[in-house]
């Protein structure tokens, strides 16, 4: 149980107060985070709260400024980057968003060793992607659709590419479905590790079905945005990776990597590009049915100037119960000797475990292994290998972070940060510098969150960079509700939940109970972190209990888990809510005729089905920004879990589970569906016929749509939206306004 | 090729004292930590003592803890055992082991003849 | 400590026989599991590390499998030199403690 910073004397709680909406949607009582943006072992650069950029020596104990404000208020820069050798800065500004990682800037390059911007061979504007070279000061950068070289700020560039098109090739940059569902970044370009060569990826869309949909904007007629999206089944892109050496680009110019012929053999994916040394490179590859990825280490031949990728150096993952990897397929990290490589993957048992391959992953040695997952490889070192966890105290929603040792006697395996701040503390991330010589881990909670500094070698903490006083006092005449995490045990499943309650929580009581549920396959709710949300106001202030529940095809819990939904979502999802709620229930304080249903996106689908399950448990739900049938979804995210809309594989089940299919069950609830017009990622068209089937079936309904706003409905649109919706449920729960 | 050379090993009255000896070869030296483990007559094996490459870490069993002293010199390649206060139970075949690493564990991938320790008086 | 419990304690068999020797750790070890074989008057051979690796050197008749608490080697066809003594040690927390051994006879 998770209880917040307790208020045991009764008089103080005259002078507290609920939350109110208002508090959540000014962002009252947000939380700060420290991350170090690591120049060197012991040094790191941070932007003041004045907006100068400091550097800041961990041994010297010294900080001086690099760049003043005044230099970054003089372009409106919004960001910075320090080329390697110190010597000149890019100055981000201009930033506009395009879809969830990428934008576009101007970019500024200022010479520290002048004071001045480079003038002359300017970069051109708007530029997609920019960064430096690993070591020096080269610059590569993405500018409509191709990719240009600059040994330095002030050369004037080499183009690297020229086939660059909008919506047609992309280089150096991934299309839409790569961004989203593979590659999650903004790039598809990376450094060698000194700089020598540079690889990138080409995607080819020229194939691809177009997505459609009107931009209102302010104009007489409304914009049409295009982007090619494929949905299931649809034709995929082609990627294609190159190699250029950057010293001398015009030599031999950019060499093909070759794709594994088993993986070439029919359509596939490239998941992820690794650095070994500045002549060895590993690619990781995907069949489009992703139960096999392939790993391939190749080598620069000098004598050929190409780069060759031998089958010895092959190294095939198979699942044969679900889909390859977790979300994505984990990525190695290399040791020392730049052959061998740690990975995160199934055992035996079915928990995600690093294991240490030296020749064949047949003979990989398995350096974890338990009833619970390793998660990330931070790093490795000569002497340790630092990973995240959930295995203390056997809660899957907790993070810690451990230290095995390498190549020290006797070896030792640490728990870092499990005793660190026990009850504060136990969700944590980590950020190293250079050999790991010194890390800060941000911890998101439980309690409040807290930065910290420490030494690599003792794991000693240096200080404190960010605590939230400010937070801390904030909210100590506030009533903050309670937090519990329990476990279920139903039929050999273990439904893992979070119960928020209201403050004056009384088990004799009867308590409206709101489900909020996300549920997508390898996600993770129900976890050990802080946060002042609208759902703690509606415990604070309303009075409602709120559950999140972590049913199957969730994360971290191992495969039998997370592997249940493969090829049948919208099932298993739905049936662990209505379960849980049926615990709810059972356990004697939830008013089991005010029972609520929210999600957003997946868990907008699942709200969806959950309401239409025809069980009465519930009496009114939301589904924001819901997916209503999976041939509407992108085709890398939904093969994944559901294989193909074809006759001969799997598209039965994608016309089993629409929303729409079940629209006559929606009849007995009071439902809200809410999209914005604009979402690229989850198109309107699934509320929309989501919409029509209701309406074909005479079923009433709430409807909202939010004009121009995409998948995450930000700035004004939020304040709506949750005031929406919280008329909506006070409503449906007979609170009074 | 590794080898392990154990020598020191004999007949000695309880409460005497005795020091083993390991001549390595064939490997560097220093780069390894070092152990020696133990066979009663008839018995099983046990794990006594261990050294780390650079002789800076010491482990022992409880059954040996504050009677035997783990030593090495890499300037000779030679590993050390100094047991004193010896007890009939310490009659064994001592084996001086080569250790290697692999990510948080470690395994005796070489090993020496033994030498046989006998305490009885 | 954590205690290393193997069985059989002994086992007849017959060349050519597919053998299976267990070793059970009282708490999780994770993989940190080696086998060894000794014959009479010798000293003890590395087999397998890791639980599963196969020392080089070693013919691949011999195999391991297991994670946390349980763990088997195998030995698909056996040969007349393979008929000795068998121990599995953990190499997960100091003391570093070995299993009572398998004697393994022919039948």
């Known amino acids: 149980i998770v209880l917040r910073p307790s208020r045991v004397h009764n008089s103080e709680e005259n002078t507290m107060r609920a939350l109110t909406l208002k508090d959540i949607l000014n962002g009252t009582f947000s939380y700060k985070t420290f991350f170090p943006n690591w120049i060197s072992g012991q040094e790191y650069l941070h932007q003041s709260a004045d907006n100068n950029i400091v550097l800041y020596n961990i041994e010297t104990g010294q900080s001086y400024t690099i760049l003043s404000n005044r230099t970054m208020k003089s372009v409106n820069a919004s960001n910075y980057g320090l080329s390697p050798d110190r010597q000149f800065v890019y100055l981000e500004s201009d930033y506009s968003k395009l879809w969830r990682y990428s934008y576009t800037a101007t970019y500024y390059i200022y010479d520290l060793s002048n004071g001045e911007f480079v003038r002359g061979n300017e970069l051109p504007r708007p530029i997609q992607y920019l960064c430096w070279s690993p070591v020096g000061s080269k610059l590569a950068y993405v500018y409509q659709n191709n990719i240009y070289l600059k040994q330095r700020p002030g050369d004037p560039p080499f183009q690297i590419t020229f086939n660059g098109r909008e919506n047609k090739i992309f280089n150096g940059i991934p299309d839409w479905v790569y961004e989203e569902e593979m590659l999650a970044t903004k790039y598809a370009l990376w450094w060698s590790p000194n700089g020598k060569f540079l690889a990138y990826a080409e995607f080819n869309d020229t194939d691809i079905p177009v997505i459609a949909y009107s931009y209102y904007g302010d104009e007489q007629y409304p914009r049409t945005i295009n982007i090619p999206y494929p949905k299931a089944g649809a034709k995929n892109p082609v990627v294609r990776i190159f190699i250029i050496d950057t010293t001398y680009p015009a030599y031999v110019g950019p060499q093909e990597v070759p794709v594994p012929a088993m993986i070439a053999s029919s359509d596939y994916y490239f998941s992820w590009l690794t650095w070994v040394t500045d002549e060895r490179v590993c690619l990781q590859w995907l069949k489009r049915v992703q139960n096999v990825s392939v790993l391939s280490i190749c080598d620069f031949r000098e004598d050929w100037q190409t780069w060759d990728c031998p089958k010895t150096q092959e190294h095939i993952e198979e699942s044969r119960t679900g889909w390859a990897g977790g979300f994505f397929v984990s990525t190695p990290v290399f040791s020392y000797d730049a052959i061998s490589y740690y990975k995160i993957f199934s055992d035996k048992d079915g928990y995600k475990h690093i294991h240490y391959i030296k020749d064949t992953v047949e003979n990989a040695i398995q350096i974890t292994s338990g009833k619970w997952e390793a998660i990330n490889i931070f790093r490795v070192t000569q002497d340790s290998l630092f990973y995240s966890s959930n295995e203390f105290e056997e809660y899957p929603g907790r993070r810690n972070i451990y230290r095995i040792s390498i190549g020290s006697y006797p070896p030792s395996k640490k728990c870092v940060t499990c005793h660190l701040r026990k009850e504060r503390c136990q969700y944590y991330t980590a950020s190293f510098s250079d050999y790991a010589k010194y890390y800060a881990l941000v911890c998101y909670g439980p309690g409040i969150p807290i930065s910290t500094l420490h030494d690599g070698r003792t794991d000693q903490e240096i200080k404190i960079l960010e605590e939230n006083k400010e937070l801390e006092n904030a909210l100590k005449n506030i009533q903050l509700p309670k937090e519990e995490i329990k476990k279920l045990e139903v039929d050999e499943i273990t439904l893992w939940y979070k119960m928020i309650l209201p403050p004056q929580f009384d088990r004799s009581k009867k308590y409206p109970l709101l489900i909020q549920v996300y549920g997508g396959p390898c996600s993770q709710s129900v976890r050990s972190v802080f946060a002042v949300n609208w759902i703690s106001y509606l415990a604070s202030k309303e009075g409602m209990v709120i559950a999140l529940v972590d049913g199957r095809g969730t994360a971290f819990q191992g495969d039998k888990l997370l592997y249940a939904v493969y090829r049948k979502l919208g099932v298993y999802e739905v049936e662990d809510q209505i379960t849980a709620v049926r615990k709810f229930i059972e356990m004697g304080f939830i008013d089991e005729k005010r029972i609520a249903i929210w999600g957003w996106s997946y868990g907008g689908y699942v709200s969806s089905l959950a309401l239409a399950s025809g069980t009465g448990l519930f009496k009114c739900g939301i589904a924001v920004a819901p997916v209503s049938s999976w041939e509407y979804y992108a085709s890398v995210y939904t093969e994944r879990f559901m294989g193909l809309p074809t006759k001969d594989d799997n598209l039965e089940h994608y016309k089993n589970s629409t929303v729409m299919a079940r629209a006559e069950y929606f009849r007995n609830v009071d439902y809200l569906l809410i999209h914005g017009t604009a979402d690229d990622n989850v198109h309107f068209q699934n509320s929309a016929q989501i919409a029509k089937a209701l309406v074909n079936a005479q079923v009433d309904f709430q409807a909202m749509w939010y004009s121009d706003q995409n998948h995450g409905l930000s700035g004004l649109s939020t304040n709506h939206l949750y005031t929406h919706m919280t008329h909506f449920l006070k409503q449906c729960f007979s609170l009074s306004d | 090729e590794v080898q392990l050379l154990e020598s020191g090993g004999g007949l000695v009255q309880p409460g005497g004292s005795l020091r083993l000896s390991c001549a390595a070869s064939?490997?560097?030296?220093?780069?390894?930590?070092m152990s020696w483990v133990r066979q009663a007559p008839g018995k099983g094996l046990e794990w006594v003592s261990g050294i780390s490459g650079s002789g800076g870490s010491t482990y022992y069993a409880d059954s040996v803890k504050g009677r035997f002293t783990i030593s090495r010199d890499n300037s000779k390649n030679t590993l050390y055992l100094q047991m004193n206060s010896l007890r009939a139970e310490d009659t064994a075949v001592y084996y001086c082991?080569?250790?290697?690493?692999?990510?948080?564990?470690?395994?005796?991938?070489?090993w020496g003849q033994g030498t046989l320790v006998t305490v009885s008086s | 400590d954590i205690q290393m419990t193997q069985s059989p304690s002994s086992l007849s068999a017959s060349v050519g026989d597919r053998v299976t020797i267990t070793c059970r750790a009282s708490q999780s070890i994770s993989s940190y599991l080696n086998w060894y074989q000794q014959k009479p008057g010798k000293a003890p051979k590395l087999l397998i590390y890791a639980a599963s690796s196969l020392q080089s050197g070693v013919p691949s008749r011999f195999s391991g499998s297991g994670s946390g608490t349980d763990f088997t080697l195998t030995i698909s066809s056996l040969q007349p030199e393979d008929f000795a003594t068998y121990y599995c040690q953990q190499s997960y927390s100091s003391p570093y403690t070995f299993g009572q051994g398998t004697k393994l006879e022919i039948k």
């Open positions: 064939g490997f560097t030296f220093s780069s390894y930590a």
């Open positions: 082991a080569k250790i290697s690493f692999y990510p948080g564990g470690t395994y005796f991938d070489y």
